[in-house]
């Protein structure tokens, strides 16, 4: 039994690092594989993750974590039984992927103006609070080719946008997801669309 | 091996304050977030309040917000629970649980408020 | 806040059975659920991480499952010590909420 592809960890900086890996054939991983995380300092406690299948070979482990600081640093033991298949670290702050944004929201009452609002998936005092960007998606369930993103690169959780940019008297759709630039992260997962008919009164044409 | 031990728990009317203690050996207290959970008699678990080891961030339920403060000494490895304003629905055993998500917890205090 | 229900709240069942308990959430909380369970006069144990995650030292009997908003708790076959009232917790935002619990009983 041999590691084919060496796990990779991102964290959510708040309470989970996930860890990814591919073995050289298929494998029962929560049967045959641990995965042991210890933070680097005297006294600390080894914390044992049962892996999960992610497809025929490959395996997936949650790794709770406390509140992550910058300096934690954790060793990494992946056990097949008594043999060492593999050992390395991983550093939660620098492989952060943040919680997708949750609750969004479309307002469609606000005189032909679309305000798309969300929550921020952190809570104040975590340092990626005042540290997120956003990107939103929205697309028509008509048009496939009716796709596109707006940037949010203020710190607010919300977008407005003119109804009359999209057409009217069909669906759309909207979703968002963060990331943070300050700790150079990969993009969040996308959170749950958001279904809305827009609709909006064509200006008066003067003749 | 992980130890958590509370203390301070007892009888106090309406109104009137108790201060809970929690003693933490077996880990090296100061690196763990720490959480206050209870138990009404015959009832299911509720989130009380949480502290951050890293920050020094404090969350609490909306149910004791304003009355009750979480506070740590990390030189005495204690966490404590300081309740004010003490309501009949308050009487509950009260536990300590360390992070990540309650992965220890003590034995309980039983805090019994009644006239 | 975010509003955990568990359902059923109390049942019966026979040593051997397959168990299934299903929590639900207001609002989308991702895989930031935790099942446990607490025996009668004990302090509770936690079974069930991230969802699907079995607790290192947790029979492989018990298992979870679900993301977003439905989750659940499956026991695939009774065991005697298994009688007891489990939890499930939301930890995806503060403040924290546990459901009201199932209490599984002797049938």
């Known amino acids: 039994m041999k590691v084919l592809q060496e796990p990779t960890c991102v964290s959510d900086y708040m309470s989970i690092s996930t860890c990814e890996w591919k073995m050289n054939g298929p494998t029962n991983c929560s049967t045959e594989l641990r995965l042991l995380y210890q933070l680097v300092f005297l006294l600390s406690e080894a914390h044992t993750c049962i892996p999960e299948n992610n497809g025929g070979a490959g395996c997936v482990c949650h790794l709770l974590m406390d509140d992550v600081v910058s300096a934690d640093n954790y060793t990494l033991d992946l056990w097949a039984g008594q043999q060492l298949l593999w050992k390395g670290s991983f550093k939660p702050s620098e492989h952060v992927k943040p919680r997708a944004p949750g609750n969004l929201t479309v307002h469609t009452n606000v005189s032909d103006t679309l305000l798309l609002t969300w929550s921020n998936p952190y809570p104040p005092r975590n340092y990626l609070y005042n540290h997120l960007t956003y990107a939103v998606n929205i697309w028509s369930e008509n048009d496939p080719a009716d796709f596109r993103i707006y940037n949010v690169t203020y710190l607010e959780p919300s977008l407005r946008i003119a109804a009359s940019t999209l057409k009217s008297g069909i669906s759309y759709r909207a979703r968002v997801r963060a990331w943070a630039q300050c700790y150079n992260t990969t993009w969040s997962e996308w959170s749950p669309s958001t279904k809305w008919h827009n609709s909006y009164r064509e200006p008066f044409e003067q003749h | 091996q992980v130890q958590l031990v509370e203390s301070g728990g007892g009888l106090v009317q309406p109104g009137g304050s108790l201060r809970l203690s929690c003693v933490a050996s077996?880990?090296?207290?100061?690196?763990?977030?720490m959480n206050w959970v209870r138990q009404a008699p015959g009832k299911g678990l509720e989130w009380v309040s949480y502290?951050?080891?890293?920050?020094?961030?404090?969350y609490y339920a909306d149910s004791v917000k304003g009355r009750f403060t979480i506070s740590r000494d990390n030189a005495k490895n204690s966490l404590y629970l300081q309740m004010n304003s003490l309501r009949d629905e308050d009487t509950a055993v009260y536990y300590c649980?360390?992070?990540?998500?309650?992965?220890?917890w003590g034995q309980g205090t039983l805090v019994t408020v009644s006239s | 806040d975010i509003q955990m229900t568990q359902s059923p709240s109390a049942m019966s069942a026979s040593v051997g059975d397959r168990v299934t308990i299903t929590c639900r959430a207001s609002?989308?909380?991702?895989?930031?659920l935790a099942w446990f369970q607490q025996k009668p006069g004990k302090v509770p144990t936690r079974l069930i991480y991230?969802?699907?995650s079995l607790q290192s030292g947790v029979p492989s009997r018990f298992s979870g499952s679900g993301s977003g908003t439905e989750f659940t708790l499956t026991i695939s076959s009774l065991q005697p010590e298994d009688f007891a009232t489990y939890y499930c917790l939301q930890w995806s935002s503060y403040p924290r909420t546990f459901g009201q619990g199932t209490k599984v009983e002797i049938k």
């Open positions: 077996g880990f090296t207290f100061s690196h763990s977030s």
């Open positions: 991230a969802a699907s």
């Open positions: 609002q989308d909380i991702s895989n930031y």
């Open positions: 502290i951050s080891r890293a920050t020094g961030a404090v």
């Open positions: 649980a360390r992070e990540p998500v309650f992965d220890y």
